[in-house]
């Protein structure tokens, strides 16, 4: 529970977190779309993928991605009253070897290919506090989050706490 | 250490109101979403609602909607449950929880308070 | 909502023994499952989370297995201290839902 001025007050302390443990607590596998039930896609073109969102034919199957969840300890804030936060964190694949990277300065979402240990561009922070939806926010940019843009996965700046309800960064997970 | 205190229980007639009070300590409060959670005498746990960290979002379980709204004030360090038009069935001991996890729910949760006791009869 | 189940209802044991707790839900929850233990007139206190991990300051002899809609709490060795009411809860799907409880008592 965890939205913007907790964000922007944390960013410090999400530069300063490091994954505890190599392994991933849980992984699975999911479909992924949007809140107005568009599916995210990957397509490879030119020997690089390329991420889409579009409305899927009836029959049409949905592309799954695998997605693993890391706990994350950081220092607790200025006020220094006690508990670490623990977070949780979430890398994404859609194929073997490629991630959901964030280009923060391009404010783009990306599929890299790359080796573990993954880049902290890999790792999105999960919220999961609007009812059966989820967000993911970037952990290199604290207040950035996945969203959608003309049709296309991007980095959307949330700058108030109201704005984390907003439905382009809100996504759901599913198992069909 | 990570404190949760619940005050404000009694008995009170159906139809009537009450405030549930919990004071919190020993974490950063104002970064984590909270939670109620019921005990009937004798029964099962029911959760009751949950309130983000800045109080921007609120969920409540449906046999409390409507009645029930929770709340928080973060420089007091206390979150609130404001119980309208009691009934019988909302007898129970009510705790304050507190997430696992900083921005999710999934982990379930980590602390709670010793419990306050409301009891709804004429 | 989601219907979680548990089995046994209640289970009489001995210093020494291994329960085993199953837990059932009614859709599939992942892995976002938790177990509470509670003692009369205490709160819960959470041992595992995420299905198998171990909440830090929880005895090893705790332990949590399962994913989708089958889930199993085990206490490998009982200690006296375990006597208790033991619960699953998913947090997978809103709202949060608990199982009705297994109690462990001394045979």
């Known amino acids: 529970a965890f939205g913007i001025s907790g964000v922007q007050k944390y960013t410090r302390a999400l530069h300063d977190s490091s994954i505890t443990g190599i392994s991933p607590i849980t992984e699975y596998l999911a479909s992924l779309s949007t809140y107005n039930d568009q599916s995210i896609t990957f397509a490879l073109e030119d020997e690089s993928y390329e991420i889409y969102v579009e409305d899927l034919k009836k029959d049409e199957k949905k592309d799954k991605v695998l997605l693993s969840y890391y706990e994350s300890q950081h220092p607790s804030n200025e006020s220094g009253d006690g508990v670490d936060g623990k977070m949780l964190m979430v890398t994404l694949s859609p194929t073997k070897d490629f991630w959901l990277h964030a280009n923060n300065k391009e404010h783009s979402v990306e599929l890299h290919k790359c080796e573990k240990p993954l880049p902290d561009q890999a790792f999105f922070v999960l919220h999961n506090m609007h009812s059966n939806c989820v967000s993911f926010e970037c952990k290199t940019d604290p207040g950035v989050f996945i969203g959608v843009k003309d049709n296309h996965l991007a980095l959307i700046k949330v700058d108030s706490s109201e704005n984390l309800c907003t439905e382009n960064i809100l996504f759901k997970l599913s198992e069909t | 250490q990570v404190q949760l205190v619940e005050s404000g229980g009694g008995v009170v007639q159906p139809g009537r109101s009450l405030r549930l009070s919990c004071a919190a300590s020993?974490?950063?409060?104002?970064?984590?979403?909270l939670h109620w959670v019921r005990q009937s005498p004798g029964k099962g746990l029911e959760w009751v609602a949950l309130?983000?960290?800045?109080?921007?979002?609120?969920y409540y379980a449906d046999s409390v909607k409507g009645r029930f709204t929770i709340s928080r004030d973060n420089s007091k360090n206390t979150l609130y449950l404001q119980m309208n038009s009691l009934r019988p069935e909302d007898t129970a001991g009510y705790f304050c929880?507190?997430?696992?996890?900083?921005?999710?729910?999934?982990?379930?949760?980590?602390?709670w308070g010793q419990g306050t006791l409301v009891t709804v009869s004429s | 909502d989601i219907q979680m189940t548990q089995s046994p209802s209640s289970v009489s044991a001995s210093v020494g023994d291994r329960v085993t707790i199953t837990c059932r839900a009614s859709?599939?929850?992942?892995?976002?499952l938790a177990w509470y233990q509670q003692k009369p007139g205490k709160a819960p206190n959470l041992l595992i989370y995420?299905?198998?991990s171990l909440q830090s300051g929880v005895p090893s002899r705790f332990s949590g297995s399962g994913s989708g809609t089958d889930f199993t709490l085990t206490i490998s060795s009982l200690q006296p201290e375990d006597f208790a009411t033991y619960y699953c809860?998913?947090?997978?799907?809103?709202?949060?839902?608990f199982g009705p409880g297994t109690k462990v008592d001394i045979k």
């Open positions: 929880a507190k997430s696992l996890y900083t921005t999710s729910w999934y982990g379930g949760f980590d602390y």
């Open positions: 020993g974490f950063t409060f104002s970064s984590y979403g």
């Open positions: 309130i983000s960290y800045d109080g921007s979002n609120k």
């Open positions: 859709q599939g929850i992942r892995s976002w």
């Open positions: 995420a299905a198998s």
């Open positions: 809860q998913q947090a997978n799907s809103f709202p949060p839902t």
